[in-house]
């Protein structure tokens, strides 16, 4: 004969454990039901009655089967430099990620604590490593035969055009200027195209290294040449 199915609450076998989606209540000394995601324990079980669950209130959640007396509070609204990629529901917390053109400089368990604007490489420098959601752009000086004349978080060093007759030689920050005959493009070293960064469609200009606090900075940063712009904390 099959073993009799025990209904919660029930006393476990000596040395035994409770089943999936059950927990052992120390006070009642019984195996009791957990509450499903989106709910919490309104009334704990006794020897004769099972756990009473209730739905989470607005702006609170539980993500796992649980027996917590209160649901967890959802995180505060996403800051201006972030976008909400997961809304606050009864079953999940809000997740904020950095908006395009920014990256997460300091992460937290879910989402981002501090967003910062992706570095823009100045003329003479090109992108050596594109930015990602969690890492900044890495710039490098343009090697001989290549140039970058932009301030950009995506542009790489490009090869100088090859002229039949050079009017002005190119350098790291300027392309060669040819006389009227049509130029061709060289395949200079270091001119290989990099994949586009994950998130760099920024409408926000990288603050120039000027002697003032960077705009869009919600930290109390010192006055002085302060290149990176940081967003507010996303807690």
């Amino acid at each position: 004969l099959p073993a009799q199915v025990a209904f919660t609450p029930y006393a476990p076998e000596p040395g035994g454990t409770c089943r999936l989606r059950e927990y052992y209540d120390q006070t009642a000394q019984m195996c009791c039901s957990k509450c499903p995601p989106g709910q919490h324990a309104k009334v704990f079980c006794t020897k004769t009655s099972d756990t009473v669950c209730d739905s989470c209130e607005d702006s609170t959640y539980t993500q796992l089967w649980n027996w917590v007396p209160e649901c967890l509070s959802c995180g505060s609204r996403c800051s201006s430099d972030q976008v909400e990629t997961q809304a606050c529901t009864r079953e999940q917390n809000r997740i904020c990620t950095c908006r395009p053109g920014w990256y997460c400089a300091l992460s937290k368990q879910e989402g981002c604590r501090l967003c910062a604007q992706l570095r823009k490489c100045r003329p003479g420098f090109g992108v050596a490593r594109p930015g990602t959601e969690t890492s900044d752009v890495v710039c490098k000086p343009c090697a001989p035969g290549t140039f970058s004349n932009t301030t950009s978080s995506t542009d790489i060093c490009r090869p100088h055009q090859i002229c039949h007759v050079v009017a002005i030689p190119g350098n790291a920050s300027m392309d060669a200027v040819c006389t009227s005959t049509s130029p061709t493009r060289s395949m200079a070293p270091g001119a290989v195209h990099l994949p586009q960064p994950v998130s760099t469609r920024s409408q926000h200009t990288q603050p120039t290294p000027a002697p003032s606090t960077a705009p869009g900075t919600s930290f109390l940063l010192p006055v002085g040449p302060s290149p990176p712009a940081e967003g507010s904390t996303g807690d």
Partner: antibody
Framework: EVQLVESGGGLVQPGGSLRLSCAAS????????LSWVRQAPGKGLEWVAY????????YYSDTVKGRFTISRDNAKNTLYLQMNSLRAEDTAVYYC??????????????WGQGTLVTVSS | DIQMTQSPSSLSASVGDRVTITCRTS??????LPWYQQKPGKSPKLLVY???KLAEGVPSRFSGSGSGTDYTLTISSLQPEDFATYYC?????????FGQGTKVEIK
């Protein structure tokens, strides 16, 4: 107020090791690139090592490459310099500096007070 | 490596004098050049960056000029607090070398 406070300097024998630390405050540490610069007694300044804000990119001067390692802990707002196989010529005041924001803002804008490393038998 | 030639290595001047320090690089560094001031027993301080831009809080008697391989730091009217050692530095390809320094002394 930006503050960079070095520690860990001292007297060490040739061939020995030392780990310098730099505790930073007053700015969003994880968004800034950092470097170590040293100055031998009565001499000029020498750049030693650089690390970018995420710790992905590191550069070293030829004189320390393979012996020194720069690292950072963004959760602790701390920069490190692990110095191995020390030589007499490594004797210097070591400065923790903020910058350069390489490729974008190329300068050292804040300097620590320095910590003295003496390599002698 | 890019060589930095700073001159003079030292100079004697009086309060009110105009002082010029030069820095020459072995190849173009595209104005990626800061100047620092260091007083005895103190840490260096940023004066000028990008060859010509004055750092925050630096008096306007300091100015930077130059491009390509030739750069100049000028103090238009030397003040008592300006007696110090001055360093140029490049931020082009690594290693990022400093000039040898110019010690400005009281005449």
């Amino acid at each position: 107020e930006v503050q960079l406070v070095e520690s860990g300097g001292g007297l060490v024998q040739p061939g020995g090791s030392l780990r310098l630390s730099c505790a930073a405050s007053g700015f969003a540490f994880s968004t800034y690139d950092l470097s170590w610069v040293r100055q031998a007694p009565g001499k000029g300044l020498e750049w030693v090592a650089y690390i970018n804000n995420g710790g992905i990119s590191t550069y070293y001067s030829d004189t320390v490459k393979g012996r020194f390692t720069i690292s950072r802990d963004n959760a602790k707002n701390t920069l490190y310099l692990q110095m191995n196989s020390l030589r007499a010529e490594d004797t210097a005041v070591y400065y923790c500096v903020r910058g350069p924001f390489y490729g974008s803002a190329n300068y050292f804008d804040y300097w620590g007070q320095g910590t003295l490393v003496t390599v002698s038998s | 490596d890019i060589q930095m030639t700073q001159s003079p290595s030292s100079l004697s001047a009086s309060v009110g004098d105009r002082v010029t320090i030069t820095c020459r690089t072995s190849e173009s560094i595209y104005s990626n050049l800061p100047w620092y001031q260091q007083k005895p027993g103190k840490s260096p301080k940023l004066l000028v960056y990008d060859a010509t831009k004055l750092a925050e809080g630096v008096p306007s008697r300091f100015s930077g000029s130059g491009s390509g391989t030739d750069y100049t730091l000028t103090i238009s009217s030397l003040q008592p607090e300006d007696f110090a050692t001055y360093y140029c530095q490049h931020f082009w390809v690594t290693p990022w070398t400093f000039g040898q320094g110019t010690k400005v002394e009281i005449k």
